[in-house]
């Protein structure tokens, strides 16, 4: 039976407004028509769902109102934005991908995309 | 090579609840999608549920059949090796053997054909 393949870039660096962007890419083995795609975050052993997003194909994907992820779908391809980032959310984020109609349901994840955060060094203090 | 052994099969009522077990040997199964599927007397077997992990984390993702949704919880503790089904609000039309299986941790986990362990089976069997 066919795996299915999940590829997404090995590193990101976010922004200095705590930005990153990266694309989560699958192959798809047939025409799935609702597709779910879920951001891990593994941090040692650790493993956190950041967000998640059940879209139909050829439409927007949509998070929750009070999520930290925004994202489009183009295809098989998925373009993923989180924001908010601190220097302590650096760590490795995993893309899970489900094909959820028509049946069979299948499930891939990504390797993971290493995200770094740079906290922006603070403003010095002026004597104006 | 993974040898499956089935348990916790039995006679029970309607509405009761029964937790079969999945004992995995030969390899750690952390790195396998394992599915329970079932198979009623003069019917084909059907896929139940199915539990994969994130390499090297206890970070599980499951699916089940729309048929057990609710009624199914699928589990696994990664230190004894074994999979948990527990089964509530039996119904008559529960009634099987029912199979675990061990097969690749991404892919089409519905489907049978994907595995390539399976156990003997345990018996269900719901009286009303």
């Known amino acids: 039976c066919k795996a299915m393949h999940v590829a997404q870039p090995a590193v990101v660096l976010a922004s200095s407004r705590g930005i990153a962007s990266f694309v989560c890419e699958y192959a798809s083995p047939g025409k799935a028509t609702e597709v779910r795609v879920t951001v891990l975050r593994q941090a040692d052993s650790q493993v956190t769902e950041v967000c998640a997003a059940t879209y139909m194909m050829g439409n927007e994907l949509t998070f929750l109102d009070d999520s930290i992820c925004t994202g489009t779908s183009s295809g098989n391809q998925v373009n993923l934005t989180i924001q908010g980032l601190r220097a302590m959310d650096t760590g490795l984020y995993i893309c899970k991908v489900e094909l959820m109609y028509p049946p069979p349901y299948y499930l891939g994840i990504g390797n993971g995309t290493q995200i770094y955060v740079i906290d922006p060094e603070p403003c010095p203090d002026s004597d104006f | 090579e993974v040898q499956l052994v089935e348990s916790g099969g039995g006679l029970v009522q309607v509405g009761d609840s029964l937790r079969l077990s999945c004992a995995a040997s030969g390899r750690s199964f952390e790195n396998y999608a394992i599915g329970w599927f079932r198979q009623a007397p003069g019917k084909e077997r059907e896929f139940v549920a199915t539990?994969?992990?994130?390499?090297?984390?206890?970070?599980?993702?499951?699916y089940y059949a729309d048929s057990v949704k609710g009624r199914f919880t699928i589990s696994g503790d990664n230190s004894k090796n074994t999979v948990y089904l527990q089964m509530t609000s039996l119904k008559p039309e529960d009634t099987a053997v029912y199979y675990c299986a061990a097969g690749g941790a991404t892919g089409p986990l519905a489907l049978d054909s994907h595995y390539g362990y399976w156990g003997q089976g345990t018996q269900v069997t719901v009286s009303s």
């Open positions: 539990i994969s992990w994130i390499p090297r984390t206890a970070y599980s993702t499951t």
